[in-house]
């Protein structure tokens, strides 16, 4: 059976998501990313709130955060373009693109991944799969390798009773079930992929996880689908 | 190095309050959850609660629910837990725990008068 | 809650001996943590997720189980493995220690 990883999850294949990435602070992880183009990363903006004096770097191609593996390459930051709106005390436009040092050397087990640019919602009850290397369990437990989970799309009205996020989710966020299957600390930043295409971006507002009446929240990507493009370009 | 520095031992009286810090250094203590728990001579180990660091969430054993009260301050990377109401019950060794992983060297309470 | 029973609650064994405990949960359980305590000492996280060894521990133990019933198994004894051992479960809530087994060396 499925033990404590992500919440609810278990140990993904090695190198089966070539796009994900940890984005990392003075050589720890801190949250997770997801590589859309060859030398850009998408993240969460509030990852960086507490980074002001640290080294940020991004690593690729990494199913262990120690173990040594070929595919696995730290890239240096030389720009971290958060979205224009984002503010520390909203979960709204939590988004950050990181350029990397260099376009990253692409292979099997680092590829970018495609980013849904339709902007409709997904539909309630599709299954989509966030991975990551956030705590696994309610010990606090952060694992090695990287950990995924598949959770269902809960619709808009459901998320915002005022017993789950009290109307606090806008058209541009989405959310996914929690109930004791969940996204968690260190998996913001992280991909939700619905269908192989990039749909959400795990928010870093302090949630609590595993909890079915607080589900988890993702920016849609294709919501910001100017922004990105205006970034990349 | 990860660590957990724990404040001294405290010798109350009945009825006092007592308030218990512990300091981590080598990490942020706002990246995991921090546990308190609670040691008795004959008596093993039992789980107080915990907090979530990053927002202040905490969790705790229904028992402990009204007796203790769990909070941390990120910005000097301690948590504190107090303890309210003391009887002889209290008498314990506390340990704080990151993740439960790492642990603090304890911190002594003695209840009497 | 979920009441974990540790079994045996004292036992003794010889360097070298193999040595198994069990903790059997109320209901059942995902997974179980092990916690070594030697006197005067703050526990040890042993073993993590059932089976998992935690950094440092050696891996002449090992732990095992599903269910309800869960072991912790050092396979050759040694005069540091005495000490009380702890099992703990984050499955369900309020997250519960067992009573511990105290291990003595003969």
């Known amino acids: 059976p499925p033990r404590g990883r992500i919440l609810g999850g278990r140990e993904a294949e090695a190198h089966a998501r070539p796009y994900m990435a940890s984005v990392q602070l003075n050589g720890a992880h801190l949250c997770g990313g997801v590589l859309v183009a060859e030398q850009w990363v998408l993240s969460a903006a509030h990852c960086l709130e507490d980074a002001a004096d640290g080294k940020v770097q991004v690593l690729l191609g990494a199913h262990s955060l120690s173990q040594p593996e070929p595919s696995k390459r730290l890239y240096d930051v030389l720009r971290a373009v958060p979205h224009p709106d984002s503010q520390p005390d909203t979960i709204d436009h939590d988004l950050l693109l990181l350029q990397l040092s260099e376009k990253a050397t692409l292979g099997p087990a680092v590829r970018p991944l495609p980013w849904q640019r339709v902007d409709r919602d997904v539909a309630p009850g599709t299954l989509c799969d966030v991975a990551g290397w956030g705590i696994v369990n309610h010990a606090g437990r952060r694992p090695d390798s990287l950990q995924h989970v598949l959770l269902p799309v809960l619709d808009r009205a459901t998320c915002n009773r005022r017993t789950h996020h009290d109307g606090a989710i806008t058209e541009r966020l989405m959310c996914a079930e929690s109930n004791r299957r969940d996204s968690c600390k260190g998996d913001s930043g992280g991909p939700l992929v619905c269908g192989g295409v990039l749909e959400g971006v795990v928010t870093s507002g302090s949630r609590v996880c595993g909890n079915r009446k607080k589900p988890g929240i993702y920016t849609r990507v294709a919501s910001y689908a100017a922004w990105i493009d205006s970034v990349l370009a | 190095e990860v660590q957990l520095q724990q404040s001294g031992a405290e010798l109350v009286k009945p009825g006092a309050s007592v308030k218990l810090s512990c300091t981590a250094s080598?990490?942020?203590?706002?990246?995991?959850?921090m546990h308190w728990v609670k040691e008795r001579p004959e008596q093993g180990l039992e789980w107080i609660g915990r907090?979530?660091?990053?927002?202040?969430?905490?969790k705790y054993d229904p028992k402990f629910q009204g007796k203790a009260t769990i909070t941390a301050d990120t910005s000097s990377n301690t948590a504190y837990l107090q303890l309210s109401s003391l009887t002889s019950e209290d008498t314990a060794v506390y340990y704080c725990?990151?993740?439960?992983?790492?642990w603090g060297q304890g911190t002594s309470v003695t209840v009497s008068s | 809650q979920i009441i974990l029973t540790q079994s045996p609650a004292i036992m003794s064994a010889s360097p070298g001996e193999r040595v198994t405990m069990t903790c059997s949960a109320s209901?059942?359980?995902?997974?179980m943590y092990w916690y070594q305590q030697k006197p005067g000492s703050s526990p040890r996280l042993l073993i993590y997720?059932?089976?998992n060894l935690a950094s440092g521990v050696p891996l002449r133990f090992s732990g095992s189980g599903s269910g309800t019933s869960y072991s912790l198994t050092i396979s050759r004894m040694e005069a540091e493995d005495a000490a009380t051992y702890y099992c703990?479960?984050?499955?369900?809530?309020?997250?519960?220690f067992g009573g511990g087994t105290k291990l003595e060396i003969k």
């Open positions: 725990a990151n993740a439960m992983d790492y």
């Open positions: 907090i979530d660091p990053a927002n202040g969430n905490t």
């Open positions: 703990q479960q984050w499955s369900s809530y309020p997250w519960t």
């Open positions: 209901s059942s359980v995902s997974n």
């Open positions: 997720d059932t089976s």
């Open positions: 080598g990490f942020k203590i706002k990246d995991t959850y």
